[in-house]
Amino acid sequence: FERTRSLQDPCSNCPAGTFCDNNRNQICSPCPPNSFSSAGGQRTCDICRQCKGVFRTRKECSSTSNAECDCTPGFHCLGAGCSMCEQDCKQGQELTKKGCKDCCFGTFNDQKRGICRPWTNCSLDGKSVLVNGTKERDVVCGPSPADLSPGASSVTPPAPAREPGHSPQ
């Protein structure tokens, strides 16, 4: 099949890192610097991505693969293949159109990116607040208030072990 294909299309013999030059009797010409072809049989090379400004190069372009970018310190990647860089904020903040703003009371953000999220409502699970929330940390829910009534133990004692061969009475 490969031999048949190459008889039909001479370009199929051109390896990655080259392009098939229609204007030169379909000669395989190397991709120029700062361009690449990641598969064989290509009629063009792709221009390499350039990591400029807030982007920095994570992986250099080669004749067979594109460059990969990430973001300079103080920024983080967004989008497929790090198509955008977004400013970091501190924990306890979120990025708004006016810059980094502290989380409102009742919300938190434990990362340098993303939005402030509401504290967990422990009572929805029938639990109580064990540790209060902050701008940087969610609340920690503890046992339900009923479990903490005087004389009640929050630790369940182990069930007595049965002896083998005895059925329950």
Epitope: S35, R43, Q50
Partner: nanobody
Framework: EVQLVESGGGLVQPGGSLRLSCAAS????????VGWFRQAPGKEREYVGT??????HYGDFEKGRFTISRDNAKNTVYLQMNNLRPEDTAVYYC???????????????QGQGTQVTVSS
């Protein structure tokens, strides 16, 4: 919005020379291959050549008469045309693409074109 503006066209006698310019506004040429195409009245668009990263690729009609170069400082690409013939009469378009060469490619952006007429 990217705008490509061609200039330098005009009337020239056979055997003469012209240098066409292509200037980009709204974006630099830094990360694009730059190509030239031409279209004569009643004919299909024809590939002239592509420039990228110090390398130029040309269509098979010009046989060394045309040269593409680039001035990064001026953000301009040039098409030097020597020994012009009547059959070179056409509208010449500048275009940019993320592909090299642009012989088989639909460009990402293309200018409005500049008329070149070769006649005695």
């Amino acid at each position: 919005e990217v705008q490509l503006v061609e200039s330098g066209g005009g009337l020239v006698q056979p055997g003469g020379s012209l240098r066409l310019s292509c200037a980009a506004s709204g974006r630099t040429f830094d990360n694009y291959a730059v190509g030239w195409f031409r279209q004569a009245p009643g004919k299909e668009r024809e590939y002239v050549g592509t420039y990228w990263s110090g390398y130029a690729h040309y269509g098979d009609f010009e046989k060394g008469r045309f040269t593409i170069s680039r001035d990064n400082a001026k953000n301009t690409v040039y098409l030097q045309m020597n020994n012009l013939r009547p059959e070179d009469t056409a509208v010449y378009y500048c275009a940019i693409s993320l592909k090299y060469p642009m012989a088989t490619v639909t460009p990402d952006y293309q200018g409005q074109g500049t008329q070149v007429t070769v006649s005695s």
